[in-house]
């Protein structure tokens, strides 16, 4: 008995040859001896069986002695065997149909689980292997699990069912809903703008949500909420924003926020939260602040960063194109009694400069210059 | 023992449509196809159509244009709409449940019928 | 649609005598065919199917015979119980299409 696997949703065509290549009386039959279709002549005939408004041949085919079935929009139940009557022969064929479902929706949050579920018809051993789409292969009977998705898992999933040494393939499109970045990090001289951007990962037709900027600011105790907004059809209105700082929004994607001024009472973290409607859970998108402020007072020179930085980051304080002066992996450097000329503060990371603030130290009799 | 009962007025005017509805009772309306006949009086029984569980339906060429059934699975039941009605669709209507099983489709369960008359 | 024709139309028997309801159908229909039995004023009742398989429950009073386009229902010893009409259907094709009827009394 031949054996023809078929996807949900598709279309199948089963083959039935006579050896008379003309067109002859052919029937085709379910298992339970029910007529699907036939012919009368050149005419199509169908019986009462469920295929009914599913089921077609290919007249253009007949004249050849090929009587196919086709069935249209598969569903599991139409797993039979499907006998082809034609010239006091029987031709059996066995479709088995199988359909393979993302739990839920196939757009997932960042760090959710995904659920694949093979349906299968009765008696079938079906096994499924699924590639996605950074390569990992997963292996399982009737479902599937992959747990904490990441956003190399967006894109085309390849899902294999291997039953009776045949295969099915399927492809499902999985979106994992993430921001670009989990982190990001913005380094600032005291005074500036500050930009911050929260680019997604992912595009869709309608976005609505809501979402909300909690900073925590290294000199304060707790945490609070700078801004909360909407996201409407990917459109954004702010509903409340703090006095100070007072952050402004733009209104469209992707969410970007503009801090006025960088001053030292604002740096730190914060964690802009976007919770996306009928979606549970949240995605979370951290951003650090990090400050510098270069000051001359007296015959002191300091230059001083706040904010979140790592340990391995040097702080420098140095003469326009000499050695520096003072080098150190602390937040805070200073040097007495300074040279006369542009002094450079610098945060670097192995080399790389990653803040740079200039002060101009005047011989002592002036004042200093802040450039 | 599954049951089918038909309702719906026993009088309809020409022109009008005809509105009948079957109830499913001791059983699930689910993974059937459930037909209508109609028999005028002295006349042989006339197969309208059928509807399966999931909307997919079958009419009779005859009655294609003036006919549309619906089922409702959460009530438990199917009905039969005819549009332009004359004279000629006084009759006795049925509901049935269709049955198919190796070599079988028959109609296995009937409702008593509902007699509509169309008259001004 | 294929046109089941069927004869007579309606017969008077005796209590015990063997009745004959033959049915055509306008092309081959294979074995797909039932007999119903409808008794006055009530819903018709399937009796045989595929041509001659008796229906779960009914007497072996009633046979079917037959096959292509040529059917016959056979009653070999009528009962008082068995008036009312009875009527074939294919089932081939669809529509599915039922033949005029055969009304049985008891003489």
């Known amino acids: 008995k031949k054996v023809v696997l078929g996807k949900k949703g598709d279309t199948v065509e089963l083959t039935c040859t006579a050896s008379q290549k003309k067109s002859i009386q052919f029937h085709w039959k379910n298992s339970n001896q029910i007529k699907i279709l036939g012919n009368q002549g050149s005419f199509l005939t169908k019986g009462p069986s469920k295929l009914n408004d599913r089921a077609d041949s290919r007249r253009s085919l007949w004249d050849q002695g090929n009587f196919p079935l086709i069935i249209k929009n598969l569903k599991i139940e139409d797993s039979d065997t499907y006998i082809c009557e034609v010239e006091d022969q029987k031709e059996e064929v066995q479709l088995l149909v199988f359909g393979l479902t993302a739990n839920s929706d196939t757009h997932l949050l960042q760090g959710q689980s995904l659920t694949l579920t093979l349906e299968s018809p009765p008696g079938s051993s079906p096994s499924v292997q699924c590639r996605s789409p950074r390569g990992k292969n997963i292996q399982g009977g009737k479902t599937l699990s992959v747990s904490q998705l990441e956003l190399q898992d967006s894109g085309t999933w390849t899902c294999t069912v291997l039953q009776n040494q045949k295969k099915v393939e399927f492809k499902i499109d999985i979106v994992v809903l993430a921001f670009q970045k989990a982190s990001s990090i913005v380094y600032k001289k005291e005074g500036e703008q500050v930009e911050f951007s929260f680019p997604l990962a992912f595009t869709v037709e309608k976005l609505t949500g809501s979402g909300e900027l909690w900073w925590q600011a290294e000199r304060a105790s707790s945490s609070k909420s700078w801004i909360t907004f909407d996201l409407k059809n990917k459109e954004v209105s702010v509903k409340r924003v703090t006095q100070d700082p007072k952050l402004q929004m733009g209104k469209k994607l992707p969410l970007h926020l503009t801090l006025p001024q960088a001053l030292p009472q604002y740096a730190g973290s914060g964690n802009l939260t976007l919770a996306l409607e009928a979606k549970t859970g949240k995605l979370h998108q951290e951003v650090n602040l990090v400050v510098m402020r270069a000051t001359q007072l007296q015959k002191n020179l300091t230059c001083e960063v706040w904010g979140p930085t790592s340990p391995k980051l040097m702080l420098s304080l140095k003469l326009e194109n000499k050695e520096a002066k003072v080098s150190k992996r602390e937040k805070a450097v200073w040097v007495l009694n300074p040279e006369a000329g542009m002094w450079q503060c610098l945060l670097s990371d192995s080399g790389q400069v990653l803040l740079e603030s200039n002060i101009k130290v005047l011989p002592t009799w002036s004042t200093p210059v802040q450039p | 023992q599954v049951q089918l009962q038909e309702s719906g007025p026993g009088l309809v005017k020409p022109s009008e449509t005809l509105s009948l509805t079957c109830t499913v009772s001791?059983?699930?309306?689910?993974?059937?196809?459930w037909s209508w006949i109609r028999q005028s009086a002295g006349k042989g029984l006339e197969w309208i159509g059928r509807i399966y569980t999931s909307g997919s339906t079958n009419y009779n060429p005859s009655l294609k244009s003036r006919v549309t059934m619906l089922v409702d699975t959460s009530k438990n039941q199917f009905s039969l709409k005819l549009s332009s009605v004359t004279a000629a669709d006084t009759a006795v209507y049925y509901c049935a449940r269709d049955r198919e099983d190796y070599y079988y489709y028959g109609m296995d369960v009937w409702g008593q019928g509902t007699t509509v008359t169309v008259s001004s | 649609d294929i046109q089941m024709t069927q004869s007579p139309s309606s017969l008077s028997a005796s209590v015990g005598d063997r009745v004959t309801i033959t049915c055509q159908a306008s092309?081959?229909?294979?074995?797909?065919l039932n007999w119903y039995q409808q008794k006055p004023g009530k819903a018709p009742k399937l009796l045989l199917y595929?041509?001659?398989n008796l229906e779960t429950g009914v007497p072996s009073r009633f046979s079917g015979s037959g096959s292509g386009t040529d059917f016959t229902f056979t009653i070999t010893s009528l009962q008082p119980e068995d008036i009312g009409t009875y009527s074939c259907q294919q089932y081939d094709n669809l529509p599915l299409t039922f033949g005029g009827g055969t009304k049985v009394e008891i003489k």
């Open positions: 595929y041509a001659s």
């Open positions: 001791n059983g699930s309306i689910s993974s059937y196809y």
């Open positions: 092309h081959d229909i294979s074995n797909y």
